[in-house]
């Protein structure tokens, strides 16, 4: 049992290392920025961001392309709930420094939680996305 877990653990680690979660990050950032544009941007937030969508992305085509690539990556974790959770935590961790304010952070988290469902995958159980920058120790 223990041996199998260690092997499973290593498999998850190598899956995470191989995975390109960047399209997921871009898709989510664009999604929350589009929502902000719809509801009116916070006048105090800095206007430019490295993830700020281009006019092409604002029409949604770029974002759906990111979503498709993101779903392909997440699909790799479908049979390992713990690994799926790790992937989502990694996305949250990678973006936590780029999110401006509590509201944007909550919005990002909400979209991130919905991501597996959007991809037609099962959301992981017992998965804590309340990640602080500084992170968790790796397994």
């Amino acid at each position: 049992r223990q041996q199998w877990e260690l092997q499973g653990d290593r498999r998850c680690q190598s899956q995470l290392e191989r995975a390109n979660l960047r399209p997921c990050e871009q898709h989510l950032m664009q999604k929350i920025q589009r929502d902000e544009d719809s509801y009116g941007r916070d006048p105090y937030s800095p206007s430019q961001d490295p993830y700020s969508p281009s006019p092409y992305d604002r029409r949604g085509a770029g974002s759906s392309q990111h979503q498709e690539r993101c779903c392909n990556e997440l699909n790799e974790f479908e049979n390992n709930q713990r690994c799926m959770c790790e992937a989502l935590q990694q996305i949250m961790e990678n973006q936590s420094d780029r999110l401006q304010g509590r509201q944007q952070e909550q919005q990002f988290k909400r979209e991130l939680r919905n991501l597996p469902q959007q991809c037609g995958l099962r959301a992981p159980q017992r998965c804590d996305l309340e990640v602080e920058s500084g992170g968790r120790d790796r397994y």
């Epitope: 017992r126 804590d128 397994y139």
Partner: antibody, heavy 123, light 110 residues
Framework: QKQLVESGGGLDQPAGSLKLSCKDS????????MTWVHQAPGKGLEWIAN????????DYLDSVRGRFTISSDNTQNMVDLEMNSLTAADMAIYFC????????????????WGQGTLVTVSS | QPALTQPSSVSGALGGSVTITCSGT????????VSWYQQLPGSVPKLLMF???KRPSGIPERFSGSKSGTTASLTISGLQPEDEADYYC???????????FGGGTKLTVL
């Protein structure tokens, strides 16, 4: 009034068997996970087993797997713990608790507890 | 030996505050939500905190929870004599597919 009531505890010999039951009144168990936790005299809490009320998921502590069986009966609002091959290490108060675990992005937490039933193992 | 480590005892002055820590690993606390329980002498455990920081209704605000990395903490401020009890943390362990409880911390109010 939400309440969980355990029964079935008592004295048994080593290698014997007991069946504990937990009945609820005041809420519908079928929407929840249920859990058994035990506490040996003067010791801390130790989780024993979880069951999703439709019976589709069961998890056990390693040291009881194969000896203990958790089951549920939604029509009776009951959760049972069948204990076989009892040893002195199983001697404890057994609590049943409602587990607030949801289907995703939440943790296990035990928000309603029974009063506990004492299991004594002695020859 | 519980896989979640808590101090066996802590004490604090009446009206003061104490923090009880619960440390684990990536496969339990680092990955999953933590809950906290209070067990008064001769009584049934009572849920104090769930999903790291959430208080069930009826639990006073002087109880607060937090989590950083693989350590969770329960802080009790405005200590009262009735807070004297055993406190337990718990979380799921993804390696063991099991819920783990900490060994418990006995709180004494001076």
């Amino acid at each position: 009034q939400k309440q969980l009531v355990e029964s079935g505890g008592g004295l048994d010999q080593p290698a014997g068997s007991l069946k504990l039951s937990c009945k609820d009144s005041g809420f519908t168990l079928s929407t929840f996970y249920m859990t058994w936790v035990h506490q040996a005299p003067g010791k801390g809490l130790e989780w024993i087993a979880n069951i999703k009320q439709d019976g589709s998921e069961k998890d056990y502590l390693d040291s009881v797997r194969g000896r203990f069986t958790i089951s549920s009966d939604n029509t009776q609002n009951m959760v049972d713990l069948e204990m076989n091959s009892l040893t002195a290490a199983d001697m404890a108060i057994y609590f049943c608790a409602r587990n607030g675990l949801q289907d995703s992005y939440s943790g296990d937490f035990f928000d309603h507890w029974g009063q506990g039933t004492l299991v004594t193992v002695s020859s | 030996q519980p896989a979640l480590t808590q101090p066996s005892s802590v004490s604090g002055a009446l009206g003061g505050s104490v923090t009880i820590t619960c440390s684990g690993t990536g496969s339990n606390i680092g990955h999953n939500y933590v809950s906290w329980y209070q067990q008064l002498p001769g009584s049934v455990p009572k849920l104090l905190m769930f999903d790291n920081t959430k208080r069930p209704s009826g639990i006073p605000e002087r109880f607060s929870g937090s989590k950083s990395g693989t350590t969770a903490s329960l802080t009790i401020s405005g200590l009262q004599p009735e807070d004297e009890a055993d406190y337990y943390c718990a979380t799921w362990d993804a390696d063991l597919s099991a819920v783990l409880f900490g060994g418990g911390t006995k709180l004494t109010v001076l």
